[in-house]
């Protein structure tokens, strides 16, 4: 298809050739176009494109571009030349390739389609039954990431409630670029009935990391002190932990946002791998106290979502108070 | 006592090269970010960037990447902020400021008053 | 980008009078990230509210923050004359205008 600007043009270029479009993994699409036939000889030939909507323009010397995009709905890109960089000199006639999902009814493709990465360790994906789809369908989940030579099946499906999901393995590789990637998840019906839905996951967004363990509360003086188990996989710069303290008497509700702390105290088991401690002052050590934690990902690593992990289990230590 | 203690102010040319210092003292430096904030006169605040000392890992601002260096010295404490070609419009007061996790500065050094001119 | 806009711009009151301080957000924003400061002439900032409401240490319980999503409140219950300030919002590499209290 070609696209011809409204303005009147001013030696321009011939267009490009054999502009084609395909998709790799399962959510890279690339273009490849020829340089345009009887370009003048002394024309240092660069492309300019765009997609549809006139988004992420770009001048480049190479005869490909590629995205990577959840194939729900048709997109296109239009190719032109020019002989140089500049974005005010007028490209060639615009030629123009689409791609098209693939093919099904649009109500029968599964809704709310979306993944969580667990601790760094594997992602879980949910997602709810398209509205014209059989109650008995048998879905099936794709995945495919950068350290991955092939698309994989997710083979652990199950149902919770109305959603249905699956998970996989994902863990963090010491790469340091893993994370600036994505993983590419499809969703579709064993029998085919079902048009499929696509997901892009940033591997910097949607971190959920496991819940810190509480491994010992101890008083001195009037201070609380609370060790924990940090949740592995994450370097310290990259998490911060909520202590909330329960007082059964005066019924307060204390929350602390606290960095990963060394245990340096005498009053905690010092040098132990992966703990931090976290002292509580001015807490009564004749009533009780109950402790929980919870941790959350630093947006300067992760996105944020507003994903805290699960609250840890609950430890307490002090005397409840008999009421006279 | 959590301090954090800056350099002297600093009167410059244009295209004059400039490094700020941020020493850190009370607490485990290499445990905390250190963040760079900008005054210009009579402004609000600026987020330029920050480091992790533990690492050196770095976040620029998109205003300022590439127009300033952050770097860090654990061994002796100390947070820089760099220019390797200062620019009339650089005049303001610098702040460092020691910043946990989620992302709040819980304290500030004095700051750092640069003046730019010809 | 997220862009915090604070509103008022200034606000004119006596001692003694309540304070009621906006920032919002130009998208969602999670509360455990957003921050409130106080500066007065010549000095560096001052954190007073970390995580949208927790006090930071040695903050008078006059000062007070609430908010989630989009919309965050500073809240300074009776005016001391020591609040008269420049007071500025923050969301990790964003923080808003200002908003300068100052005395009717």
């Known amino acids: 298809d070609y696209k011809d600007d409204d303005e009147s043009r001013t030696e321009t270029q011939p267009p490009v050739t054999n502009l084609s479009v395909s998709v790799e993994n399962l959510c890279t699409v690339i273009w490849t176009w020829n340089p345009p036939e009887g370009a003048s000889s002394n024309c240092s030939l660069w492309y300019f494109s765009h997609f549809g909507d006139k988004q992420d323009k770009k001048i480049a010397p190479e005869t490909r571009r590629s995205i990577e995009v959840p194939l729900n709905e048709r997109i296109c890109l239009q190719v032109g030349s020019q002989c140089s960089t500049n974005e005010s000199e007028k490209p060639s006639i615009l030629v123009e390739k689409c791609i098209s999902p693939p093919e099904g009814d649009p109500e029968s493709a599964v809704t709310e389609l979306q993944c969580i990465w667990h601790n760094l360790s594997y992602m879980k994906c949910s997602w709810l039954p398209g509205r014209n789809t059989s109650p008995d369908t048998n879905y099936t989940l794709y995945y495919w990431h950068r350290s991955l030579e092939k698309i994989h099946q997710c083979e652990n499906i199950f149902r919770e409630g109305q959603y249905f999901g699956c998970s996989f393995d994902l863990t963090k590789v010491k790469d340091s670029s893993f994370e600036q990637h994505s993983v590419q998840i499809m969703v579709k019906d064993n029998a085919g009935k079902i048009k499929p839905s696509f997901n892009i996951v940033p591997l910097t967004s949607r971190v959920k990391p496991d819940p810190p363990h509480i491994k010992n509360l101890s008083f001195h003086n009037d201070d609380l002190y609370v060790q924990w188990e940090n949740p592995q996989n994450f370097i310290s710069r990259c998490l911060f932990y909520e202590v909330e303290v329960n007082n059964s008497q005066t019924e307060t509700h204390n929350v602390f946002y606290v960095q990963e702390a060394k245990c340096e105290n005498p009053e905690f088991e010092r040098n132990v791998e992966n703990t931090s401690c976290f002292m509580v002052p001015g807490v009564l050590p004749d009533t009780l106290n109950t402790v929980r934690i919870r941790v959350k990902t630093n947006k300067l690593c992760y996105e944020d979502d507003k994903l805290w992990s699960n609250w840890s289990q609950e430890m307490s230590i002090g005397k409840k108070r008999n009421s006279t | 006592e959590v301090q954090l203690v800056q350099s002297g102010a600093e009167v410059k040319k244009p295209g004059e090269s400039l490094k700020i210092s941020c020493k850190g003292s009370?607490?485990?430096?290499?445990?905390?970010?250190i963040g760079w904030v900008r005054q210009m006169p009579g402004k609000g605040l600026e987020w330029m960037g920050v480091?992790?000392?533990?690492?050196?890992?770095?976040r620029y601002s998109p205003s300022f990447q590439g127009q300033v260096t952050i770097s860090a010295d654990k061994s002796i404490s100390t947070a820089y902020l760099q220019w390797s070609s200062l620019k009339a419009s650089d005049t303001a007061m610098y702040y460092c400021?020691?910043?946990?996790?989620?992302?709040?500065?819980?304290?500030w050094g004095q700051g750092t008053l640069v003046t730019v001119s010809s | 980008e997220i862009v915090l806009t604070q509103s008022p711009g200034t606000l004119s009151l006596s001692p003694g009078e309540r304070a009621t301080l906006s920032c919002r957000a130009s998208?969602?924003?999670?509360?455990?990230?957003l921050a409130w400061y106080q500066q007065k002439p010549g000095q560096a900032p001052r954190l007073l509210i970390y995580?949208?409401?927790s006090r930071a240490t040695g903050i008078p319980d006059r000062f007070s923050g609430s908010g989630s999503g989009t919309d965050f409140t500073l809240t300074i219950s009776r005016l001391e004359p020591e609040d008269f300030a420049v007071y500025y919002c923050?969301?990790?590499?964003?923080f808003g205008q200002g908003t300068k209290v100052e005395i009717k």
């Open positions: 400021a020691r910043m946990p996790n989620w992302g709040s500065f819980d304290h």
């Open positions: 009370g607490y485990s430096f290499t445990s905390y970010w």
């Open positions: 480091i992790y000392p533990g690492d050196s890992y770095t």
């Open positions: 998208q969602s924003i999670s509360s455990s990230y």
């Open positions: 995580g949208a409401s």
């Open positions: 923050q969301q990790y590499e964003t």
